[in-house]
C-alpha cells in the first residue's frame, strides 16, 4: 500500500500547527515536566516491516486525535488552530486506514504487531492519567503538547523511512 505523496507534507503541516498552538512558554512549566515513556522501540527498530509500521502509526495518530478532540482539549487551545490540527490528523487517519485495511485483507499484519499497538495505547493512558492528576492545567497541556510534538516527529521519521523503502 502506497501512502499518498501529500502524506509527508500533511505530517509537517500537523507539526507546524501543533507548534503554533503553544500558549505559554515551556520554560514556565519546568516543574511539570514528565517522562511518559514514549515506546521508541516500536518506532525506530531496524526490523520494522512496512505492514506493522503502518498499523502502529495508525494507532498513534488515532490516539492523538482522540486526545485533542476531548472537551478538556477544546477548553485549552485556540479553537481555530485546534480545528485545523484535528482536520489534518483526520486526513492522515484516512490515508493510514486505507493501508491498514488493505494489508489486513492480504494478511500482512503479523500478530507480533499487537504488542506494539498495546504499547502505544499504554503510552496514551499515561498521558491521560497525567492530565487528570494535574487537573488539566495550562502547564500540563503545554507539557503534553511538547510530548506529542516529539512523538509525531519520531513517527514522521518512520514514515520517511517507509517511503524510502518503497
Amino acid at each position: 500500500c502506497d501512502l499518498p505523496e501529500t502524506h509527508s507534507l500533511d505530517n509537517r503541516r500537523t507539526l507546524m500547527l501543533l507548534a503554533q498552538m503553544s500558549r505559554i512558554s515551556p520554560s514556565s512549566c519546568l516543574m511539570d515536566r514528565h517522562d511518559f515513556g514514549f515506546p521508541q522501540e516500536e518506532f525506530d527498530g531496524n526490523q520494522f516491516q512496512k505492514a506493522p509500521a503502518i498499523s502502529v502509526l495508525h494507532e498513534l495518530i488515532q490516539q492523538i486525535f482522540n486526545l485533542f478532540t476531548t472537551k478538556d482539549s477544546s477548553a485549552a487551545w485556540d479553537e481555530d488552530l485546534l480545528d485545523k490540527f484535528c482536520t489534518e490528523l483526520y486526513q492522515q487517519l484516512n490515508d493510514l486506514e486505507a493501508c491498514v485495511m488493505q494489508e489486513e485483507r492480504v494478511g500482512e499484519t503479523p500478530l507480533m504487531n499487537a504488542d506494539s499497538i498495546l504499547a502505544v495505547k499504554k503510552y496514551f493512558r499515561r498521558i491521560t492519567l497525567y492530565l487528570t492528576e494535574k487537573k488539566y492545567s495550562p502547564c500540563a497541556w503545554e507539557v503534553v503538547r511538547a510530548e506529542i510534538m516529539r512523538s509525531l516527529s519520531l513517527s514522521t521519521n518512520l514514515q520517511e523511512r517507509l517511503r524510502r523503502k518503497e
Partner: antibody, heavy 122, light 107 residues
Framework: EMQLMESGGGLVQPGGSLRLSCVAS????????MSWVRQAPGKGLEWVAS????????YYAPSVKGRFSISRDNSNNTLYVQMNSLGVEDTAFYYC???????????????WGQGTLVIVST | DIRVTQSPSSLSASVGDRVSISCQTS??????LNWYQQRPGKGPQLLIS???TLQSGVPSRFSGSGSGTDFILTIISLQPEDSASYYC?????????FGQGTKVEIK
Amino acid sequence: EMQLMESGGGLVQPGGSLRLSCVASGFTFKSFAMSWVRQAPGKGLEWVASVGSQGGSKYYAPSVKGRFSISRDNSNNTLYVQMNSLGVEDTAFYYCVKETDAVATMDALDMWGQGTLVIVST
Amino acid sequence: DIRVTQSPSSLSASVGDRVSISCQTSQSVNIYLNWYQQRPGKGPQLLISAASTLQSGVPSRFSGSGSGTDFILTIISLQPEDSASYYCQQGYITPYTFGQGTKVEIK
C-alpha cells in the same frame, strides 16, 4: 500449578557469552509479557529486559542494551536471554518473571522463578 | 529513568509490632508502584500491585497506600514469617526500577 524454571547459568569468562532459558507451565504463556530480573549476591533487584506477549516489543535496561537479547518461543512456552560480552558486573542470580499484562510498563511482576546463577570470572 | 528511593534500609521489630516502609519515586508514577517480599534463599514474591491491591494468598496484615510519588507498605502486626527483604518497584515506564530494599528482622 504455575511454574517458571530457569536453566543455563554457570561460570563464564569475561567477554564470554551465555544463553539462559526459562520454561513456563501452568498458565497461558503466549498471553503475557515476560521479563528477566537479576540480583547480584547480597544486593538488590535490577530489571534486565522485557518482551511482549507475541515477541514484538522488546525493552532493555541501559546496562545491558546492545549486549543482551531477549526472545521467546510461544510454541514451546520458553523465554530466552542471549548474553554477550559479559563482564564481572553481570554476575548475579537471573530470574525469569511473568508480567501481569501483555506488554511492558504499567504492570507488576507477579510470578518469579527460583533463579539461575551466572558467575563471570577468570 | 525514574529513581526509586526506599527507607529504611533495615529495621528490627518485635512480633505484633506495626511496621511501615516508605518508597519515593523521582516523578509521579500515578498508582503504578508494586511491593515484593523476598525471603532468604528464595525468589521474590509480589505482595501488592498498583499501590494498594493485595495479591491473592497474601495475609491481610499487609497493606499498601499512596499515589503519585509517595508510597507506604504497612505490616499491621508483624509475624515471625515476615522476616524478609521488601522491595518497591515502579511499573509505570521502562526501565522498571526497584528501591534498594528494606531488610526486616524480628527482635
